[in-house]
């Protein structure tokens, strides 16, 4: 005997009740796959997170996060606290990075400048909470001995007449 | 279904107490930590409190420190918010949060929050 249920396409589940008829998912039900024997439940997006996509009856709801928190997860299973840049989330809230780190985002932690030496180059720009250290040429090139040819012309770029 | 239901709430005196409950169902209340946070009039979620599976580790921001105790009772299913010297700032609404259990991606996520008691501190 063929199974009838693998003509129920998505959006439909296939009642046993009556004779394996396809019956379309019940409101805040869905299957995203043919062939199903129940619906599943939709996905309900409240308290911490916001709808980004509505269910359908062939697709779950998408959440997001409320603002000053964002997604953790596959399929955004949690919302985690925001943090201002320069901060990062601890046990007891959001912050301030210590010196010598930074973070430049609203999540994730705080990390160590950029130590410049270990290239053999000087620090051109100084780290701040929010910024890492911005990394310049060698102290050797900086010497007053070193060479001062003047740089060649920028190349221009094909295309472009000349201002 | 995870439930999760504030009760407590209510209109108080500047530096009054007030004790917020929260009864949790359709999950296993001990394998998670769980967390306290309120929105204020025209502001938004702010993180308050949070406590681990068993009651040993305890944070708060630092403005209820000292002031707000965060506890939990296992065998009933219930998180509670003993809320002392309550200032004017401490008015909003006060949601009780999952949090993470010890697999979760963080300990400061949450993925599930209750309808919220409402706070009131008046002179």
């Known amino acids: 005997l063929q199974d009838l249920c693998s003509n129920c396409p998505a959006g439909t589940f296939c009642d046993n009740n009556r004779s394996q008829i396809c019956s379309p998912c019940p409101p805040n039900s869905f299957s995203s796959a043919g062939g199903q024997r129940t619906c599943d439940i939709c996905r309900q997006c409240k308290g911490v997170f916001k709808t980004r996509k509505e269910c359908s009856s062939t697709s779950n709801a998408e959440c997001d996060c409320i603002s000053g928190y964002h997604c953790l997860g596959a399929e955004c299973s949690m919302c985690e606290q925001d943090c201002k840049q320069g901060q990062e989330l601890t046990k007891k809230g959001c912050k301030d990075c210590c010196f010598g780190t930074f973070n430049d985002q609203k999540r994730g932690i705080c990390r160590p400048w950029t130590n410049c030496s270990l290239d053999g180059k000087s620090v051109l720009v100084n780290g701040t909470k929010e910024r890492d250290v911005v990394c310049g040429p060698s102290p050797a090139d900086l010497s007053p001995g070193a060479s001062s040819a003047t740089p060649p012309a920028p190349a221009r770029e094909p295309g472009h007449s000349p201002q | 279904e995870v439930q999760l239901v504030e009760s407590g709430g209510g209109l108080v005196q500047i530096g009054g107490s007030l004790r917020l409950s929260c009864a949790a169902s359709?999950?296993?209340?001990?394998k998670y930590w769980m967390i306290w946070v309120r929105q204020a009039p025209e502001k938004g979620l702010e993180w308050?409190?949070?406590?681990?599976?068993?009651?040993?580790?305890?944070y708060y921001v630092d403005s209820v420190e000292g002031r707000f105790t965060i506890s939990r009772d296992n065998a009933n299913n219930s998180l509670f918010l003993q809320m002392n010297s309550l200032r004017a700032e401490d008015t909003a609404v006060y949601y009780c949060?999952?949090?993470?259990?010890?697999?979760?991606?963080?300990?400061?996520?949450?993925?599930?929050s209750g309808q919220g008691t409402r706070v009131t501190v008046s002179s």
């Open positions: 949060a999952r949090g993470g259990d010890d697999y979760s991606i963080s300990h400061f996520g949450m993925d599930v």
């Open positions: 359709g999950f296993t209340f001990s």
């Open positions: 308050v409190a949070n406590i681990n599976q068993d009651g040993s580790e305890k």
